[in-house]
């Protein structure tokens, strides 16, 4: 581990002395001196600082721009930033969630493996043998082919990854 520095945790070194850092939610107004303590002031409305700090300006809360498909997931405080998420049917383009894009739909032949959230896109997977999807959808999984046997029917047309099997009546062979 690094050896300790001349000032303790939650302190900073300035002009040969250790001054207290400002607590989260407050900004630095003036450094301490030999005769005075560090002077801090609370961040204003729509501002925050999330660490012990010596910042002279608070950071502005993130703006969740509805024109970019964003909405507020969690309102910011003096100690935390606003958290944005996307409107229903949309998801963030990055971890910082600065803009949104429409959830992707899975094409015919593909089904939804994982439904999209506000922060992640739809995950599609190809329909395996025995399954199909005949629609473009952001919700539908691959469906299993109809089992003709359980309906006392026979396969008249084989299924594909995009189409279900077609069942038909069994040929009645006369003795």
């Amino acid at each position: 581990p690094e050896p300790p520095t001349a000032c303790r945790e939650k302190q900073y070194l300035i002009n040969s002395q250790c001054c207290s850092l400002c607590q989260p939610g407050q900004k630095l107004v003036s450094d301490c001196t030999e005769f005075t303590e560090t002077e801090c002031l609370p961040c204003g409305e729509s501002e925050f600082l999330d660490t012990w700090n010596r910042e002279t300006h608070c950071h502005q809360h993130k703006y969740c721009d509805p024109n970019l498909g964003l909405r507020v997931q969690q309102k910011g405080t003096s100690e935390t930033d606003t958290i944005c998420t996307c409107e229903e049917g949309w998801h963030c383009t990055s971890e910082a969630c600065e803009s949104c894009v429409l959830h992707r739909s899975c094409s015919p032949g593909f089904g939804v493996k994982q439904i999209a959230t506000g922060v992640s896109d739809t995950i599609c997977e190809p329909c395996p043998v025995g399954f199909f999807s005949n629609v473009s959808s952001a919700f539908e999984k691959c469906h299993p082919w109809t089992s003709c046997e359980t309906k006392d029917l026979v396969v008249q047309q084989a299924g594909t990854n995009k189409t279900d099997v077609v069942c038909g009546p069994q040929d009645r062979l006369r003795a």
Epitope: I14, N15, S16, Q17, C18
Partner: antibody, heavy 116, light 107 residues
Framework: QVQVQQSGAELVRPGTSVKVSCKAS????????IEWVKQRPGQGLEWIGV????????NYNEKFKGKATLTADKSSSTAYMQLSSLTSEDSAVYFC?????????WGQGTLVTVSA | HIQMTQTTSSLSASLGDRVTISCRAS??????LNWYQQKPDGTVKLLIS???RLHSGVPSRFSGSGSGADYSLTISNLEQEDIATYFC?????????FGGGTKLEIK
């Protein structure tokens, strides 16, 4: 009154080490940082590092990392600077000073001469 | 590292003169600027801290001013005992750095 008293001049061989002491009096030793400064003959002042005597925490000028080691003994109100692997470049006057809004009180300086 | 520049390395003045010594930092140091006096015998004293705060026991003929990156030390009525080298030092950002010094001599 505040006083900062340093150890006497040293004549040392190249490759060896030297330890300079700095005894403080007239104030609470653990309440103020101790700063160390180098001055080569006819030259300016160069900051070496700082120590907090309360718990021994230090900050060094990158240039002096591995060259200078700062320590402090609370019981005797004395700070120390050890200089290792001495060369002619280390020949200088070394000052200690009490911190607290600038280098508020200085020692008289310790002349270290490195010579074969 | 913050560079401290004292453009005048030596200065001649007469007793009773008003003398100004300047010091410039390579960036804003937020008034964390100190002035030191080094006498010919090598002893060093703090004169002024935080740009303008006179250290205890320092005569009131010494004063300091400045902000941002530009600072100055003024001796309003030069006396014989003021013959010394004067150094500025920034205490805003590690590593602490000093100006090269201004040597004050009597004309």
């Amino acid at each position: 009154q505040v006083q900062v008293q340093q150890s006497g001049a040293e004549l040392v061989r190249p490759g060896t080490s030297v330890k300079v002491s700095c005894k403080a009096s007239g104030y609470a030793f653990t309440n103020y940082l101790i700063e160390w400064v180098k001055q080569r003959p006819g030259q300016g002042l160069e900051w070496i590092g700082v120590i907090n005597p309360e718990f021994g925490g230090t900050n060094y000028n990158e240039k002096f990392k591995g060259k200078a080691t700062l320590t402090a003994d609370k019981s005797s109100s004395t700070a120390y600077m050890q200089l290792s692997s001495l060369t002619s470049e280390d020949s200088a006057v070394y000052f200690c000073a009490r911190g607290g809004g600038g280098f508020t009180y200085w020692g008289q300086g310790t002349l270290v001469t490195v010579s074969a | 590292h913050i560079q401290m520049t004292q453009t005048t390395s030596s200065l001649s003045a007469s007793l009773g003169d008003r003398v100004t010594i300047s010091c410039r930092a390579s960036q804003d140091i937020s008034s964390h600027l100190n002035w030191y006096q080094q006498k010919p015998d090598g002893t060093v004293k703090l004169l002024i801290s935080y740009t303008s705060r006179l250290h205890s026991g320092v005569p009131s003929r010494f004063s300091g001013s400045g902000s941002g990156a530009d600072y100055s030390l003024t001796i309003s009525n030069l006396e014989q005992e003021d013959i010394a080298t004067y150094f500025c030092q920034q205490g805003n950002t590690l590593p602490w750095t000093f100006g090269g010094g201004t040597k004050l001599e009597i004309k």
